[in-house]
């Protein structure tokens, strides 16, 4: 089978600071030197691109300066971190991997990680 399998955790709970991390792992059918990783958010059948990065194998992932994502790669594994999350950002975050170079091109899409974000309770005012 020429398809590329992508694995990611089913559920992740964001920290109280609105940070969520998960691993996206792909079983590469080829010897790719250039890989593109995209995080998609699916909520209420709407799909939006959260962030995307292209990296050379062995190098760091480089997201755009204004991206809410950071990440590191190790072999066929990408460690993704999404920051600045709020309760309204709860949803299914899908890892999409593309082997860009050399040909042939391969596409792999994970089943998604449900990220739950709970806004922290505001600190009660003190009388002191």
């Amino acid at each position: 089978c020429k398809a590329m399998h992508v694995a990611q955790p089913a559920v992740v709970l964001a920290s109280s600071r609105g940070i969520a991390s998960f691993v996206c792992e792909y079983a590469s059918p080829g010897k790719a030197t250039e890989v593109r990783v995209t995080v998609l958010r699916q909520a209420d059948s709407q799909v939006t691109e959260v962030c995307a990065a292209t990296y050379m194998m062995g190098n760091e992932l480089t997201f755009l300066d204004d991206s809410i994502c950071t990440g590191t790669s190790s072999g066929n594994q990408v460690n993704l971190t999404i920051q600045g999350l709020r309760a309204m950002d709860t949803g299914l975050y899908i890892c999409k991997v593309e082997l860009m170079y050399p040909p042939p091109y391969y596409l792999g899409i994970g089943n998604g990680t449900q990220i739950y974000v709970i806004d922290p309770e505001p600190c009660p005012d003190s009388d002191f």
């Epitope: 089978c1 398809a3 999409k96 040909p103 091109y105 596409l107």
Partner: antibody, heavy 118, light 108 residues
Framework: QVQLVESGGGVVQPGRSLRLSCAAS????????MHWVRQAPGKGLEWVAV????????NYADSVKGRFTISRDNSKNTLYLQMNSLRVEDTAVYYC???????????WGQGTLVTVSS | EIVLTQSPGTLSLSPGERATLSCRAS???????LAWYQQKPGQAPRLLIY???SRATGIPDRFSGSGSGTDFTLTISRLEPEDFAVYYC?????????FGQGTKVEIK
Amino acid sequence: QVQLVESGGGVVQPGRSLRLSCAASGFTLSRYGMHWVRQAPGKGLEWVAVTWYDGSNKNYADSVKGRFTISRDNSKNTLYLQMNSLRVEDTAVYYCTRVDWWGAFDFWGQGTLVTVSS
Amino acid sequence: EIVLTQSPGTLSLSPGERATLSCRASQSVSSSYLAWYQQKPGQAPRLLIYGASSRATGIPDRFSGSGSGTDFTLTISRLEPEDFAVYYCQQYGSSPWTFGQGTKVEIK
């Protein structure tokens, strides 16, 4: 709304060149892969070429490799197909199409007819 | 290269009938990367189904897709007059991107 409009088709002699354009609107070109697909008269669909995101990665069908060049100008939201050394068998309607988030081809242009004949 | 073979070549049916179109791959294709398109004369193809079974935006629920591995099916539960067209399957999980040769659904 998303719209793709091809232009540049016409009648050309074998061995000559032609450049097709595809003007995209309603979305940001740099975030999508873009393909050219062709259809010979009365025949099925045949994939021709793709250019990815910033344009640095491209793939071609064996039938056009070395003769056709796909490119994009993201600042102009335009996709191109430079066709050199044209052959009679390149006669077809050429469609540009966008890759959706899942990899399928979700929007297509109306097509432009290229006829290679002596 | 993954070769997709569609059958039958032509399907002659009446409005209201059920249409079952088959697409067979020369090697296993992940169901995530199999699409179906509809094309009417003089028009560009239109995406109907992606991921083997997910309907594209605006596609009526009489269209459904199923299958896995090497065998995929497009079903039109009750043919409407506007459904008579040519249908293509496509794999998009790896290059080169390939299409089936098409199945023509014509009015009986």
